[in-house]
């Protein structure tokens, strides 16, 4: 079980102190009040990588 401040959650997820585990940032669109949403970036990741600069 991960503790806060140790290894970070995987990309697209954030630590929830209320649940003691990493949670998917995608759920913050539906429920932004969740505690872990504070650790999610404001802009969601792009759905694909651009093929040109």
């Amino acid at each position: 079980e991960q503790a806060p401040g140790t290894a970070p959650c995987s990309h697209g997820s954030s630590w929830s102190a209320d649940l003691d585990k990493c949670m998917d940032c995608a759920s913050c669109r539906a429920r932004p009040h969740s505690d872990f949403c504070l650790g999610c970036s404001a802009a969601p990741p792009a759905p694909f990588r651009l093929l040109w600069p």
């Epitope: 759920s27 539906a30 429920r31």
Partner: antibody, heavy 120, light 108 residues
Framework: EVQLLESGGGLVQPGGSLRLSCAAS????????MMWVRQAPGKGLEWVSY????????HYADSVKGRFTISRDNSKNTLYLQMNSLRAEDTAVYYC?????????????WGQGTLVTVSS | DIQMTQSPSSLSASVGDRVTITCRAS??????LNWYQQKPGKAPKLLIY???SLQSGVPSRFSGSGSGTDFTLTISSLQPEDFATYYC??????????FGQGTKVEIK
């Protein structure tokens, strides 16, 4: 079989204290968030407090903030509610309930409740 | 806190009737809505979670629908053991979880 058994209720004078306990069995207690919910006589349900699986995060309804303290002992499979500065309006049946494993989503198992009466 | 309003507050119905209870949230709560059944002197029992998902072991005559602000609990054919009080509960605005005031289903 999942079981939650509350104890510690009773009659207490205004300003007094009580400590409620909720003994859990039939499931692995430590991964689950737990809550206390109360129901005044003849009234509806009111969420009181929440505690995370480790006990490191707690939340309270405004009506009890600063007076009640939720805690847990995962080694004893037990949830607690320390109730101080009790008021007449705290009179209710107090239920402990197991939270879902996502995020405050639902209460899937409840104890049978313990009655707290605050009266002089 | 988000306010949850149930209607009606009570209703009388007969065995075999189709019963519908509504719950309205004071703001959008997506699908974060649960339904509980409570019988006198007993603890509440989870019936429906996430607006429409049936909890394990709950009879299929119970169903839930809705999203946003308006939700419905339907009992397709009322059985004698269904006479009870039903509560909705929102889990959107955490940790300020709130319940509706309850709907008592009585025997006609």
């Amino acid at each position: 079989e999942v079981q939650l058994l509350e104890s510690g209720g009773g009659l207490v004078q205004p300003g007094g204290s009580l400590r409620l306990s909720c003994a859990a069995s039939g499931f692995t207690f430590s991964p689950y968030p737990m809550m206390w919910v109360r129901q005044a006589p003849g009234k509806g349900l009111e969420w009181v407090s929440y505690i995370s699986p480790s006990g490191g995060s707690t939340h309270y309804a405004d009506s009890v903030k600063g007076r009640f303290t939720i805690s847990r002992d995962n080694s004893k499979n037990t949830l607690y509610l320390q109730m101080n500065s009790l008021r007449a309006e705290d009179t209710a049946v107090y239920y402990c309930a197991r939270g879902g494993d996502t995020y405050f989503d639902y209460f899937d198992y409840w104890g049978q409740g313990t009655l707290v009466t605050v009266s002089s | 806190d988000i306010q949850m309003t149930q209607s009606p507050s009570s209703l009388s119905a007969s065995v075999g009737d189709r019963v519908t209870i509504t719950c309205r949230a004071s703001q959008s709560i997506s699908s974060y809505l649960n339904w509980y059944q409570q019988k006198p002197g007993k603890a509440p029992k989870l019936l429906i979670y996430a607006a429409s998902s049936l909890q394990s072991g709950v009879p299929s005559r119970f169903s839930g629908s809705g999203s946003g602000t308006d939700f419905t609990l339907t009992i397709s054919s009322l059985q004698p053991e269904d006479f009870a009080t039903y509560y909705c509960q929102q889990s959107y605005s955490t940790p300020g979880i709130t319940f509706g005031q309850g709907t008592k289903v009585e025997i006609k």
